[in-house]
Amino acid sequence: EPCVEVVPNITYQCMELNFYKIPDNLPFSTKNLDLSFNPLRHLGSYSFFSFPELQVLDLSRCEIQTIEDGAYQSLSHLSTLILTGNPIQSLALGAFSGLSSLQKLVAVETNLASLENFPIGHLKTLKELNVAHNLIQSFKLPEYFSNLTNLEHLDLSSNKIQSIYCTDLRVLHQMPLLNLSLDLSLNPMNFIQPGAFKEIRLHKLTLRNNFDSLNVMKTCIQGLAGLEVHRLVLGEFRNEGNLEKFDKSALEGLCNLTIEEFRLAYLDYYLDDIIDLFNCLTNVSSFSLVSVTIERVKDFSYNFGWQHLELVNCKFGQFPTLKLKSLKRLTFTSNKGGNAFSEVDLPSLEFLDLSRNGLSFKGCCSQSDFGTTSLKYLDLSFNGVITMSSNFLGLEQLEHLDFQHSNLKQMSEFSVFLSLRNLIYLDISHTHTRVAFNGIFNGLSSLEVLKMAGNSFQENFLPDIFTELRNLTFLDLSQCQLEQLSPTAFNSLSSLQVLNMSHNNFFSLDTFPYKCLNSLQVLDYSLNHIMTSKKQELQHFPSSLAFLNLTQNDFACTCEHQSFLQWIKDQRQLLVEVERMECATPSDKQGMPVLSLNITCQMNK
Amino acid sequence: QKQYWVCNSSDASISYTYCDKMQYPISINVNPCIELKRSKGLLHIFYIPRRDLKQLYFNLYITVNTMNLPKRKEVICRGSDDDYSFCRALKGETVNTTISFSFKGIKFSKGKYKCVVEAISGSPEEMLFCLEFVILHQPNSN
């Protein structure tokens, strides 16, 4: 069975084709080759002789037991080599010779018992080494690591490392890899020698499900003393063994580390006193809790010095009391409990993401809700009922506002966005908004992107609601049940580049409303009920138009619409997916491609 | 279409068939077997995925006695610092995991419950596997 040509001459997918040898009928120009799940078993010298351009090679689960000297020799362009799931028994010293550009080596689940005799010391370009899910017992980083000066990611998770000694990291003292991210999760650790990490700098350290008791966790974290780490991730996994007990003593040792960003990811334990628990983390710049249960929500009003707080997929009794002077970014998403938003006091806040919480807002939105006048980004998407009772007083700095898939109330009672003259992006898609007030978008003089799909309009008519949006470049009016539009609806939108009118109920097409859209490049009228043109004589669309989508409409391929059908043929160079433009009537022409019709007035005679 | 039996409990019988062409082997054990009136137990899965499990989610299509419920999307792996350790599993890596579950106080009427589980993962998104579970429910007391 032949390989699948994904990108001609470049990418070939040969997965699970029962190949016992490397295929010899692929072009020399092949750059990406997936040979996974083939019983190759043995890689001899110059196995990839015929693939001089190869950049990505996937050999996952190829039953490879032996890799000879020079197996990859001549693959000087190879950047990624994947060996996952091969039961390697014999790895020659020169197995990886010739890989002068290799950046990513994945040797997950390959029976690797030690880094010491893993022959990769010459791979100077290596950025990522993944040796997770192996049999490695010692964390001693061999001397050859001093050659791997570009290494950024080292994944040793799911190995057998129990202890870390001072001598294990000696090589890092000789050549501090300032950018190294190290994952040691799922190693059964019970001892870290104090001083082992002294004066070591890491970009990221991940330790999840490493400790089988609170005491072990405590002493191991104390053993990290002296470490300087940009981002520290601690926690557990839901499907692995979890700690019986967890209290404030667990994290006391963190006071002896220098940490920029901290994240606790999943803990099968109720956090009650977070002030004491995170006592050593009051001055990290970014603090993050993922998938934890928090009992006392008042604790977030303590004087933490965080600039970014992230609470994701957590459980709360009620919406937390947030009073944090220095906080600039708050991400509070996909959380449970506390369904009603309550005011927060965050005077420095610039970025606020409250999406996907099922929250309801009794009144939105003004400075008093968030306790800040600095807000630039606000995401309230995928929530419950949001009642618009104020037009963003004190929030004039906003540039990005997202309400999609929340239920907006009182949107057509006043000019909700009047004060948002700096707003660039607005998404009110699928918000149950019924536009019944022409001043709905007044004030949005800087707006560039407006998404309002899935809403509705009074009498299914689009009025002149965009008159102030002179900078608009993108407008989505799809799925709005529209049947008609004002001839001057778009007259002020001279910068508009993309207009989506798809999935509405238009029965005819008219070019007149678009005459002022001098920058329009994309117009999507797919999934309407267009049968014909509104007027006999259709003008041209703006000369800037490059893509016109009229697919999945109800074209009437009859003689009376001959001029419209001819006009469509004349627009052929603009039309996309023409094969999906089919006649709906008459019944004998149903399903015929509109552009293949021979339009003569013999049509129905 | 070959049917794979999972287990029997006092009020349910569970089996599944593949609903995709690939039919890559997957081993599923439930211990103790699910009782629909109340259940607590361990789900054990052994599987070698044909793509990375990063950003794994399930599309669930549930049918209760021929009545179709709306499609439900269950995100399992968000893509970074996920709840489950198997979210970091790579294509070709053995996934051998045990997940605890519990539910109580749900009253199910007698009949045939079907659940099509479409597993989607990776970037670009592609189907990982598709299984159709059939649960025959014989409540002792309804």
Epitope: G44, F49, S50 | -
Partner: nanobody, 117 residues
Framework: EVQLVESGGGLVQPGGSLRLSCAAS????????MGWFRQAPGKEREHVAL????????YYADSVKGRFTISRDNAKNTVYLQMNSLKPEDTAVYYC??????????WGQGTQVTVSS
């Protein structure tokens, strides 16, 4: 078994030309691809040019594109490498290689090419 014998190497001035030949004998029916590699002192062996016996498709390394030409004479079981506009950095031992259907690679003994004024 496949035997490969190279010839045509030598000393040439920058800008000059040489033509290398590689004669194959033995189980030549099993050969899929043939090619030229080179190895300069202290460097890894690298591809120069490849040719597919079945359909004549060709590959050149970027460093030799437009200057070198690989060709084959099936009747003589010989592959050639015409090298024009030679540069000092082309100095190396040039090896002929043949890959069989079983993925085994056979090598010639090599021929020295020196480009120097």
């Amino acid at each position: 078994e496949v035997q490969l014998v190279e010839s045509g190497g030598g000393l040439v001035q920058p800008g000059g030309s040489l033509r290398l030949s590689c004669a194959a004998s033995g189980s030549i029916f099993s050969i899929n691809d043939m090619g030229w590699f080179r190895q300069a002192p202290g460097k890894e062996r690298e591809h120069v040019a490849l040719i597919r016996i079945k359909d004549g498709s060709i590959y050149y390394a970027d460093s030799v594109k437009g200057r070198f030409t690989i060709s084959r004479d099936n009747a003589k079981n010989t592959v050639y490498l015409q090298m024009n506009s030679l540069k000092p950095e082309d100095t190396a031992v040039y090896y002929c290689a043949a890959k069989t259907g079983t993925s085994f690679v056979y090598w010639g003994q090599g021929t020295q090419v020196t480009v120097s004024s």
